[in-house]
Interface confidence: low
């Protein structure tokens, strides 16, 4: 069955953009002008998952790369990583749970909750140029709110 996808960029609530930091990590920092071209473009795919009125299951791939954000346990802690996949088989509607995030829209802000680890969210630090990570708290120091920009 076909998977619907759209291309977008994400900025955190502090307007930090997301860029590649090495081959398998994202970091968040403020970009301006031509530097905005460095930000990663996501291919957000609408996939199968737990349904509810306010949560939409999505997978977040990097456009034109066979990399997807995934959530795994490392040293007993839920961890965000970029995982390489076979481009012939991805994206697909029935993505493995580690690739699935519940996109939650509240007051025009988006949160991305791990389907594998409920109440853990894609997060950024207040500090500049720090890795994007999976955080277990909302409303604290770390930022879990994002805005999405449509990319053609």
């Amino acid at each position: 069955a076909p998977v619907r996808s759209l291309h977008c960029t994400l900025r955190d609530a502090q307007l930090k953009s997301l860029v590649m930091s090495g081959p398998y990590e994202l970091k968040a920092l403020h970009l301006q002008g031509q530097d905005l071209e460095q930000q990663v473009v996501f291919s957000m795919s609408f996939v199968q998952g737990e349904e509810s009125n306010d949560k939409i299951p999505v997978a977040l791939g990097l456009k034109a790369k066979n990399l997807y954000l995934s959530c795994v346990l490392k040293d007993d802690k839920p961890t965000l990583q970029l995982e390489s996949v076979d481009p012939k088989n991805y994206p697909k509607k029935k993505m493995e749970k580690r690739f699935v995030f519940n996109k939650i829209e509240i007051n025009n802000k988006l949160e991305f909750e791990s389907a594998q680890f409920p109440n853990w969210y894609i997060s950024t630090s207040q500090a500049e140029s720090m890795p994007v990570f999976l955080g277990g708290t909302r409303g604290g120091q770390d930022i879990t709110d994002f805005t999405m920009q449509f990319v053609s």
Epitope: P2, R4, L6, F46, F150, V151, S152
Partner: antibody
Framework: QVQLVQSGAEVKKPGASVKVSCKVS????????IEWVRQAPGKGLEWIGE????????NYNEKFKGKATITADTSTDTAYMELSSLRSEDTAVYYC?????????????WGQGTLVTVSA | DIKMTQSPSSMYASLGERVTITCKAS??????LSWFQQKPGKSPKTLIY???RLVDGVPSRFSGSASGQDYSLTISSLQYEDMGIYYC?????????FGGGTKLEIK
């Protein structure tokens, strides 16, 4: 509120083409899929295809490939469907509708329909 | 293509009666199913999406359910304004396909 306003009825000769427009207001045009559906007189509904105006992604029903061409103009918030090589069996009401990009929303808003009559 | 077999094709029911219309999908559609109502000379109106979610403004007497690949639309207490043609739609797999329609008339 959300509105989809379609162009008026058309009468065309067999072999001609027609371009139906669907002007959208009340939401961000680029973000949501526009669907095209047809209904022949006294018949049911048939899905033709869809476009996501923000990035130009298009999906067609194979049956209508070569018959329908779907486009969108984000500067005017208008979607178009052109039908070519018209035949009498293309006589139908053509509807545009919008669905949220979140996929599990289903069709939510519809245009008023455009009657295309193909007659010699 | 996925075939949506809708039944009955037409029916009469009395005001206040409970009415159920069904659609059977020829294969798994992952619950990606909508229901529409259409009145003569008018555009379709969406009632329900994703099997059971009511569109804003649709009366609560309308409900949707699923059992395997059988999908149902139920009107708990038929009102005069409910007459029209009802269609189901699967939007899981291209091409999206509609059921053949159920014409609902008042007895």
């Amino acid at each position: 509120q959300v509105q989809l306003v379609q162009s008026g009825a058309e009468v065309k000769k067999p072999g001609a083409s027609v371009k139906v427009s669907c002007k959208v207001s009340g939401y961000t045009f680029s973000r949501y899929w526009i669907e095209w559906v047809r209904q022949a007189p006294g018949k049911g509904l048939e899905w033709i295809g869809e476009i996501l105006p923000g990035n130009g992604n298009i999906n067609y029903n194979e049956k209508f490939k070569g018959k329908a061409t779907i486009t969108a103009d984000t500067s005017t918030d208008t979607a178009y469907m052109e039908l070519s090589s018209l035949r009498s069996e293309d006589t139908a009401v053509y509807y545009c509708s919008t669905i949220y990009y979140d996929y599990d929303q289903g069709f939510t808003y519809w245009g008023q329909g455009t009657l295309v009559t193909v007659s010699a | 293509d996925i075939k949506m077999t809708q039944s009955p094709s037409s029916m009469y029911a009395s005001l206040g009666e409970r009415v159920t219309i069904t659609c059977k999908a020829s294969q798994d559609i992952d619950r990606y199913l909508s229901w529409f109502q259409q009145k003569p000379g008018k555009s379709p109106k969406t009632l329900i999406y994703r099997v059971k979610r009511l569109v804003d403004g649709v009366p609560s007497r309308f409900s949707g359910s699923a059992s395997g690949q059988d999908y149902s639309l139920t009107i708990s207490s038929l009102q005069y304004e409910d007459m029209g043609i009802y269609y189901c739609l699967q939007y899981d797999e291209f091409p999206y396909t509609f059921g053949g329609g159920t014409k609902l008339e008042i007895k």
